[in-house]
Interface confidence: low
């Protein structure tokens, strides 16, 4: 049976297509090609007579067609108007006609698309942004990419207008993009240049650095404030509620205890109209904010009950600190036999009794910090006294 095949079926505008013929009968008088699904003299493209080997153009000939001896038809420099059906009529020697119809589709070579936006400077959590992929063309698939990834599933992302429009509902600062649109048809694909959003946001709650709270007199106080914001935040500082200056950094040289207080950083975004503050307490003191771990020593760690005495000493290099003693989680002294001396650095037990055996430790502290020693174990033994009858006590 006579058939035709389009090579290719989908043709790019400006390219060529070959209507290939299969099962062409042997004994032929000639053949003709027609535009459309039926034989219509008014729509004849070309006729070919075997005897004369002469091709005769018909009313529908555009000058871009070439017919071959095997009945195939080549159409060059195709346009979208060439899309559709083509019918071949074969006239056999017995003058019996055979027909076959084929078709092809012409698609344009797509241009580089561009993205238009209804708002390129949206405000976070407030504005929506609609991107539209231009131009609008027929028989085109529209795709979107965010950060070189296809669109994630999100209730904030909506496609409309045949996927040509991408709407971001309630933008966030993470929606800067870049955004790209891609247009596709069966013969070509093209992607736009990336577009980024300048999302206005913030300020977030400011962070004051460094995190230190305690400073020594005579030191320099240098505080820096940062709040995520676009456009960048404008900063101001208050000390104990009194305005100081409008800078991101606050510097006070050679501080004294009078510089202790609450330091407030105020961040403002004039576009969003939002303000945020953070308060930091600064304490200027001679006291060490970190007390070193004290060392505990015993004159002896194994003693004889009711006979021996023992001295425990708590050593520290820190100044301006106090010392307290603990025994089995109880504060000392806890009996008349226990005495503290030398500014609580020494704990004396005289005499030692059985109930004094156990774990001792000391703690050094000042108003802003404290630290404990490792524990020390005191062992209390009792010597067995020989009885007059020679019997040991039972």
């Amino acid at each position: 049976q006579l058939t035709t095949e389009s090579m290719p079926f989908n043709v790019a505008e400006g390219k060529e297509v070959l209507l290939l013929v299969h099962n062409l009968p042997q004994q032929l008088f000639g053949y003709s090609w027609y535009k459309g699904e039926r034989v219509d003299g008014n729509r004849q493209i070309v006729g070919y007579a075997i005897g004369t080997q002469q091709a005769t153009p018909g009313p529908a000939n555009s000058g871009r067609e070439t017919i071959y001896p095997n009945a195939s038809l080549l159409i060059q420099n195709v346009t979208q108007n060439d899309t559709g059906f083509y019918t071949l009529q074969v006239i056999k020697s017995d003058l019996v006609n055979e027909e076959a119809t084929g078709q092809f589709h012409v698609y344009p070579e797509l241009p580089k698309p561009s993205i238009s936006s209804n708002n390129s400077n949206p405000v976070e959590d407030k504005d929506a942004v609609a991107f539209t992929c231009e131009p609008e063309t027929q028989d085109t698939t529209y795709l979107w990419w965010i950060n070189n990834q296809s669109l994630p599933v999100s209730p904030r992302l909506q496609l409309s207008n045949g996927n040509r429009t991408l709407t971001l509902l309630s933008v966030t600062r993470n929606d800067t993009g870049p955004y790209e649109c891609e247009i596709q048809n069966p013969v070509s694909a093209n992607r736009s240049d990336p577009v980024t959003l300048n999302v206005t946001y913030g300020p977030d709650t400011p962070t004051i650095s460094p995190s230190d709270t305690y400073y020594r007199p005579g030191a320099n106080l240098s505080l820096s404030c940062y709040a995520a914001s676009n456009p960048p935040a404008q900063y101001s500082w208050l000390i104990n509620g009194t305005f100081q200056q409008s800078t991101q950094e606050l510097f006070i040289p050679n501080i004294t205890v009078n510089n202790s207080g609450s330091y407030t950083c105020h961040a403002n975004n004039s576009v969003t109209g939002c303000n945020r503050t953070t308060v930091k307490t600064i304490i200027v003191t001679e006291l060490s904010p970190v007390v070193a771990k004290p060392q505990i020593k015993a004159s002896k760690t194994t003693v004889t009950g009711d006979k021996d005495s023992v001295n425990l000493t708590c050593s520290t290099n820190d100044t301006g600190i106090s010392i307290r003693w603990f025994f089995k989680n109880q504060s000392l002294p806890s009996s008349e036999r226990m005495k503290l001396s030398q500014g609580n650095t020494t704990l004396s037990i005289n005499p030692v009794k059985r109930e004094d055996a156990g774990t001792y430790w000391c703690e050094v502290f000042n108003p802003i910090s404290k630290n404990q020693s490792d524990p020390i174990m005191l062992n209390v033994n009792y010597n067995a006294l020989p009885q007059e009858n020679g019997l040991s006590p039972g």
Epitope: N121, R173, N174, T176, T196, P231, P232, Q234, S270
Partner: antibody, heavy 109, light 97 residues
Framework: KPGETVKISCKAS????????MNWVKQAPGKDLKWMGW????????TYADDFKGRFAFSLETSASTAYLQINNLKNEDMATYFC??????????????WGQGTSVTVSS | SLSASLGGKVTITCKAS??????LAWYQHKPGKGPRLLIH???TLQPGIPSRFSGSGSGRDYSFSISNLEPEDIATYYC????????FGGGTKLEIK
């Protein structure tokens, strides 16, 4: 000439001027690039690198999408090519993405 | 300066004085022109920059490579940290053998 003042201009185009900050970079003959500081084109607030505090001033003419670098009391060591460079705006600051071709300043008595 | 052969590969390193959290960019600078941003955030290629250029690193240590060297790659290359204000590294002048 030494002691004089020079003002260099940098005109931006193709984007919204007030969205991106503008940096200034110095390159003395045969030397590496050196960051001088930047100006916030939205607020007009300049930030100067330590070596460029005092005689150097950044300014704007927002309506003309133009940034300026002024050098007062010119010294021989100011002889260099000065570049303006747009402060990149990504999800995080991306350095400097687009640069001017540079303006050469010659100091001689 | 650094010398390499056409079609070859060259790697430039950049060491920061402290952790810069990957906030490092690489630039190509040719005489009479403004520098051109090739890579930002350590490894993100700028649009239009060929994939022959690449960057990597973290913490204090970063590197930048050009493979399949071409004549137009002759230039001076700079790294820029932008974690804390901006600091350029010393330029590396690339020459072709």
């Amino acid at each position: 000439k030494p002691g004089e003042t020079v003002k260099i201009s940098c005109k931006a185009s193709g984007y919204t001027f007030t969205v991106y900050g503008m940096n200034w970079v110095k390159q003395a003959p045969g030397k590496d690039l050196k960051w001088m500081g930047w100006i916030n084109t939205y607020t007009g607030e300049p930030t100067y690198a330590d070596d460029f505090k005092g005689r150097f001033a950044f300014s704007l003419e927002t309506s003309a999408s133009t940034a300026y670098l002024q050098i007062n009391n010119l010294k021989n060591e100011d002889m260099a090519t000065y570049f303006c460079a747009r402060k990149a705006f990504y999800r995080y600051d991306g350095g400097m993405d687009y640069w001017g071709q540079g303006t050469s300043v010659t100091v001689s008595s | 300066s650094l010398s390499a052969s056409l079609g070859g590969k060259v790697t430039i390193t950049c060491k920061a004085s402290q952790d810069i959290n990957k906030f490092l960019a690489w630039y190509q600078h040719k005489p009479g022109k403004g520098p051109r941003l090739l890579i930002h955030y350590t490894s993100t290629l700028q649009p239009g920059i060929p994939s022959r250029f690449s960057g990597s690193g973290s913490g204090r240590d970063y590197s930048f490579s050009i493979s399949n060297l071409e004549p137009e790659d002759i230039a001076t290359y700079y790294c820029l940290q932008y974690d804390n204000l901006y600091t350029f590294g010393g330029g590396t002048k690339l020459e072709i053998k």
